[in-house]
């Protein structure tokens, strides 16, 4: 399986929210013994390879954000844990993954990769991650919503508040 | 904070079947591995296995013919079992969180077992 | 399995000094690499994960670094409490294994 990231770059408001997404690619086996462990923090394009680095999101670890189940069952981290820092992430039946970063400010610009752990059983774990960049803009020049930029060409799109 | 507390018998009898349990306190079982790890007297650290959540498991070749994890979730609990001890299976027994595409981060604090006659 | 091999076994330093560790995979293992910490009488405690990630609460005087077969564990200036067992471990096959060891003591 892959994890596709349909937009590279989001640019949003200052204040705005924002929904970051990630996709599972390819098939998906939905039998007992595999399960998917999920999650998000960010990063730095590093030495080694993008999203080798592991920084909080507004101070929430990676274990903070986590999302587990087994195939495409649906699933959220921790509601409490994750509200109280304007973050929630979910996963949908379909191989969608994210996460809602609520209230943006200057400092939530950055590098974010999601990250599919494969879980299966007598197997090794098969890791996965994508990239993506959000910058949040004040200021005159900054757009009244969000634009995500596509990862496959250079259109835009306007999209609403999450 | 999540803690973990190994409790069993420290001596056990050759040929037998060594028997220990893992209670998960102060956070939940669900969606990491559990593991068992073991250092004998003065030596290095050997993964055993480990079950994860969804019942999951994986055992170290060297001793999958031995061994057997299981978990009782409503317990918050997870257990090992070694058969047909012999003396080389005189160690420190560690259980441990193991959190996928990271590491061991949280360890209980050990427990000896003596295969002894 | 892939076997970690760590050197040296023992490295002698004083308070202060710089301490260089070694551990060298018998294939690749990417960056799946983490070191721990081990004092008498107590279980492994997590420094690095990831080749280079500091572990929560681990002071910056830890570093690791490396990829591939040859890593690293910097520990820039020894503090009293450093003395210990130094143990790297693999995560990129399973069985999952750890280095034999390299025991840091007081010149």
């Known amino acids: 399986f892959k994890v596709a990231t349909p937009y590279s770059l989001y640019v949003c408001p200052e204040g705005q929210n924002v929904t970051l997404t990630c996709r599972l690619l390819g098939p998906v086996d939905k039998g007992h013994d595999v399960t998917f462990y999920k999650t998000w923090y960010r990063s730095s394009r590093g030495e080694v390879q993008t999203c080798s680095e592991r920084r909080p999101i507004r101070n929430l670890t990676f274990q903070d954000l986590h999302l587990h189940h087994g195939g495409h069952q649906a699933a959220n981290t921790s509601h409490d844990l994750a509200q109280r820092h304007g973050l929630e992430s979910a996963s949908d039946h379909h191989g969608n993954f994210s996460i809602t970063m609520r209230n943006l400010t200057l400092l939530d610009s950055g590098l974010y990769c999601c990250l599919v752990v494969e879980i299966r059983a007598a197997a090794s774990e098969h890791r996965v991650h994508g990239a993506m960049e959000l910058q949040v803009q004040t200021g005159k020049d900054a757009p009244s919503n969000c634009v995500v930029y596509p990862s496959s060409s250079q259109d835009s799109e306007n999209i609403t508040a999450a | 904070q999540v803690q973990l507390q190994e409790s069993g018998p420290g001596l056990v009898k050759p040929s037998e079947t060594l028997s220990l349990t893992c209670t998960v306190s102060?956070?939940?079982?669900?969606?990491?591995?559990w593991s068992w790890i073991r250092q004998p007297p003065g030596k290095g650290l050997e993964w055993i296995g480990y079950?994860?959540?969804?019942?999951?498991?994986n055992y170290n070749p060297s001793l999958k013919s031995r061994v057997t994890i299981s978990v009782d979730t409503s317990k918050s609990q997870f257990s090992l079992k070694l058969s047909s001890v012999t003396a080389a299976d005189t160690a420190v027994y560690y259980c441990?969180?193991?959190?996928?595409?990271?590491?061991?981060?949280?360890w209980g604090q050990g427990t000896m077992v003596i295969v002894s006659s | 399995e892939i076997v970690l091999t760590q050197s040296p076994a023992t490295l002698s330093l004083s308070p202060g000094e710089r301490a260089t560790l070694s551990c060298r995979a018998s294939?690749?293992?990417?960056?799946?690499l983490a070191w721990y910490q081990q004092k008498p009488g107590q279980a492994p405690r997590l420094l690095i994960y990831d080749a280079f990630n500091r572990a929560t609460g681990i002071p910056a005087r830890f570093s690791g670094s490396g990829s591939g077969t040859d890593f690293t564990l910097t520990i820039s200036s020894l503090e009293p409490e450093d003395f210990a067992v130094y143990y790297c471990?693999?995560?990129?096959?399973?069985?999952?294994?750890f280095g034999g060891g390299t025991k840091v003591e007081i010149k």
């Open positions: 441990a969180r193991d959190i996928p595409a990271f590491a061991f981060d949280i």
């Open positions: 294939q690749s293992v990417s960056y799946y």
């Open positions: 079950i994860y959540y969804s019942g999951s498991t």
């Open positions: 471990q693999q995560r990129i096959n399973w069985p999952l294994t």
């Open positions: 102060g956070g939940s079982i669900s969606s990491y591995y």
